[in-house]
């Protein structure tokens, strides 16, 4: 067979430095940044993605509207902490000591403090909604084909499992996904919503993470599905603790 | 197509060392690991340890671990298997192998005798 | 380190027979197994990697199962050439351990 070479890759991670020096020959495959192995059978973890990023060079129809205490991701890239499972750590901090509490998908949910500041436990994100507008088509996508569509994508190209995918809602242009999964739904191998969540962003914006496979191609009955705008709403199983000053910001 | 020559037969005292090497060709050598194993007579396989040429890494089993030196040379394709203070429970034929995802090309083995 | 647990450690059968070995890890191995046969005076040769996948040239009579602690190795119909000794090897994790070996002899 070929080189080994040409075989050890890591098809769901790009980020990775993969080599043949496993036990038994194995193909043995860590995430850039962090050096932690990584399961290529399943997605990375989104710790370890934003890790390997930072280290590399540069039903009815109508719309959910997000509680008041959905979080969206302000705060943007930084480099995480993560555990030794690949999660992100409860407190983050950056270099001058400024710390923050995070949820289960790495997003900011208290004000920031200093190093004394604690965060008692990683607070899971058991609901996700992805809120996207698409480009102008000739006609509305039919309701029943988009929904088929998306959790056709979600299941076979990020391994999530069907149930997982609550809702899909669409009013044209505005499509949204509702992902839940609580921490007595996710059993031991189940991919987590943050981290499929994670993948269809960076798939959305051209920046797909799987090795080798051609970037997102997203067609609803042969036409193309092409997204224009991404927000993506956290809600966390315990509501966030900001101040009074930032909720009336 | 993929071959592992070994050297010939050898004879050693108790305490002697000994070095078995094992020519690789028909791939590129630092793309694979090469892993030892030894068979005593009538008896079933041992492992013993593995390196990659790629990086010169390596990991040995614990019982062979100060006894055992594995090296390989790059520029002749060469792997190398060193076994000091030889004891007659010793005496086996050691195979190299390369090893592939548990997939494996061996060596034709190298007969290790101590006895004095 | 993983106990690689391979029975029967004999058996005898004949031509045409269907021959099942099994080989059990003392933990999960997550697949990483593979098979050998070997010959008497001759290095083994590889059969099945990863639990279930033939290695190209080998007879399709020869295939493997199982999954977590428990695997086989199954010959289909036995032929005269396959009159040998058999061995599982885990590759989950160093040390890299062997079974017992099972030696397949004629009846």
């Known amino acids: 067979h070929t080189a080994a070479q040409d075989n050890c890759t890591c098809p769901t991670n790009k980020m990775t430095v993969c080599s043949p020096d496993g036990p038994g020959g194995r193909c043995q495959c860590r995430a850039l940044g962090s050096g932690m192995a990584v399961d290529c059978s399943t997605l990375t973890s989104k710790c370890l993605l934003l890790k390997a990023r930072m280290s590399a060079p540069k039903n009815a129809r109508t719309l959910v509207r997000p509680s008041e205490h959905a979080l969206v991701d302000n705060d943007g890239l930084y480099d995480p902490d993560c555990d030794p499972e690949g999660r992100f750590k409860a407190r983050q901090c950056n270099q001058t000591s400024v710390c923050w509490c995070v949820n289960s998908v790495g997003v900011r949910r208290t004000d920031k403090g200093d190093l004394s500041l604690r965060c008692d436990e990683l607070v899971r994100t058991h609901h996700i909604l992805i809120d996207l507008r698409h480009r102008p088509t000739a006609g509305a996508f039919n309701h029943s084909d988009l929904d088929a569509e998306l959790r056709r994508l979600f299941r076979e190209r990020y391994r999530l499992h069907p149930k997982f995918v609550a809702a899909v809602h669409y009013e044209q242009p505005t499509i949204q996904i509702e992902l839940r999964q609580n921490t007595s739904q996710k059993a031991a191998g189940d991919v987590d919503i943050g981290d499929a969540a994670y993948y269809f962003e960076r798939d959305i914006k051209g920046e797909s993470l799987f090795q080798g496979r051609g970037g997102l191609d997203l067609r609803v009955r042969g036409e193309p599905l092409q997204v224009e705008r991404t927000l993506i709403y956290y809600l966390d199983e315990i509501p966030p603790k900001f101040s009074m000053k930032r909720l009336t910001a | 197509q993929v071959q592992l020559v070994q050297s010939g037969a050898e004879v050693k005292k108790p305490g002697s060392s000994v070095k078995v090497s094992c020519k690789a060709s028909g791939y590129r050598f630092t793309d694979y690991v090469i892993n030892w194993v030894r068979q005593a007579p009538g008896q079933g396989l041992e492992w013993m340890g593995q390196?990659?040429?790629?990086?010169?890494?390596?990991h040995y089993n614990q019982k062979f671990q100060g006894r055992a030196t594995l090296t390989a040379d790059k520029s002749t394709n060469t792997a190398y298997m060193e076994l000091s203070s030889l004891r007659s429970e010793d005496t086996a034929v050691y195979y190299c192998?390369?090893?592939?995802?548990?997939?494996?090309?061996w060596g034709q083995g190298t007969l290790v005798t101590v006895s004095s | 380190d993983i106990q690689m647990t391979q029975s029967p450690s004999s058996l005898s059968a004949s031509v045409g027979d269907r021959v099942t070995i099994t080989c059990k890890a003392s933990q999960g191995i997550n697949n990483y197994l593979s098979w050998y046969q070997q010959k008497p005076g001759k290095a083994p040769k590889s059969l099945i990697y990863?639990?279930?996948r033939l290695v190209s040239g080998v007879p399709s009579r020869f295939s493997g199962s199982g999954s977590g602690t428990d695997f086989t190795l199954t010959i289909s119909s036995l032929q005269p050439e396959d009159f040998a000794t058999y061995y599982c090897l885990q590759y989950d994790e160093f040390p890299l351990t062997f079974g017992g070996g099972t030696k397949v002899e004629i009846k």
């Open positions: 990863r639990a279930n």
């Open positions: 390196i990659y040429p790629g990086s010169d890494t390596f």
């Open positions: 192998a390369r090893f592939f995802e548990g997939l494996a090309y």
